[in-house]
């Protein structure tokens, strides 16, 4: 479905697992038409998101599609938790889905799990 | 559109285990969660798992947790149930199924793939 | 794990009149995003199923007008406003909000 409204393409409920002290990227793939919209990053706090101001974020462009970035530099282990990518567009808001990140602390875990472990059983991760 | 076409149909024996295939296409299956559901002979519909194609991450019901295993080959848009110590009750049809994971645009369901399980 | 239990288990309606069929959920199917993923199926006999209704009340292309679906919180309904023959079929609701998905134990239409 072509459209030229600003969408925001992070799949519902979807998951990345990931070790503190690793760098990680997460993205908010954003399609636009014209002018880049304004973006930011929050991160839920039960049913409230919270801005997320202070942290280092970048564009990355592509010939379809462009990737605003929030950077973990490094993962710790409170990041932990869901995150949401948002839109200014037009005096509208566009919100994403959240998508969520298990951080492992490699302090506790003796061993890095596997990405089958990670993905099946994430309630396991952050021990 | 968006079209699965499963494996054919399987016989095995209590303790096997069986590999059934889904291929997609009219989709880019990163673009899609994909997923498992089996229905007994004159049952209801039970969710196996799904997997995360852009990512290998799977999710099963506890039921099958360490039995079943969802893969996915996104080079060829296919998709993969193996489910291990099989025995009687797993005799049933196993259908895959994918939807956008993106806005809820499809839902499609494969043809089904009978499995039977018998000595 | 979410029960889905839908009734009655089945129901003969005249051609030309009106099915209900009730799904009630165990708890609130509202996701983070705050919609509530709940899907009605459609199984003919022989067939594999059919998505009808996403997100409580949202028709699937290509689905006819005379299907219809409402409800909030744990209680939701799907409406045929006109029974036809080719509507001969079992239904199933089932969330896609909680894992593990979970299916009600479907509910059969027959012509009376």
């Known amino acids: 479905k072509e459209s030229c409204d600003v969408q925001l393409y992070i799949k519902r409920q979807s998951e990345h697992s990931i070790l503190a002290g690793d760098p990680f990227e997460l993205e908010c793939p954003v399609k636009y038409c014209a002018n880049r919209p304004h973006v930011t990053w929050c991160k839920l706090n039960g049913t409230t998101c919270v801005k997320l101001e202070d942290r280092q974020t970048s564009w990355k462009e592509e010939k379809n599609i462009s990737f605003f970035i929030l950077h973990f530099e490094p993962v710790l282990p409170n990041d932990n938790g869901s995150y949401r990518c948002s839109a200014n567009f037009q005096s509208n808001l566009i919100e994403s889905h959240s998508t969520t990140l298990y951080v492992t602390d490699v302090k506790s875990a003796s061993e890095r799990p596997s990405k089958d472990e990670m993905a099946s059983r994430p309630w396991l991760l952050y021990r | 559109q968006v079209q699965l076409v499963q494996s054919g149909a399987e016989v095995k024996k209590p303790g096997a285990s069986v590999k059934v295939s889904c291929k997609a296409s009219?989709?880019?299956?990163?673009?899609?969660?994909m997923y498992w559901v089996r229905q007994a002979p004159g049952q209801g519909l039970e969710w196996i798992g799904r997997i995360d194609p852009a990512n290998g991450y799977t999710r099963y019901a506890q039921k099958f947790q360490g039995r079943a295993t969802v893969t996915a080959d996104t080079s060829t848009s296919t998709v993969y149930l193996e489910l291990s110590s099989l025995r009687s009750e797993d005799t049933a049809v196993y259908y895959c199924?994918?939807?956008?994971?993106?806005?809820?645009?499809?839902?499609?369901w494969g043809q089904g793939t009978t499995v039977t399980v018998s000595s | 794990d979410i029960v889905m239990t839908q009734s009655p288990d089945s129901l003969a309606v005249s051609l030309g009149e009106r099915a209900t069929i009730n799904c009630k959920s165990s708890q609130s199917l509202l996701d983070s995003d705050g919609k509530p993923y709940l899907n009605w199926l459609q199984q003919k006999p022989g067939q594999s199923p059919k998505r009808l209704i996403y997100l409580v009340s949202k028709l699937d292309s290509g689905v006819p007008d005379r299907f219809s679906g409402s409800g909030s919180g744990t209680d939701f309904t799907l409406t045929i406003s006109s029974v036809q023959a080719e509507d001969v079929a079992v239904y199933y609701c089932?969330?896609?909000?909680?894992?593990?998905?979970?299916f009600g134990q479907g509910t059969k239409l027959e012509i009376k």
């Open positions: 199924a994918v939807n956008d994971g993106y806005f809820e645009y499809f839902d499609v």
């Open positions: 089932w969330q896609d909000t909680h894992f593990p998905r979970t």
């Open positions: 009219g989709v880019n299956i990163k673009d899609t969660y």
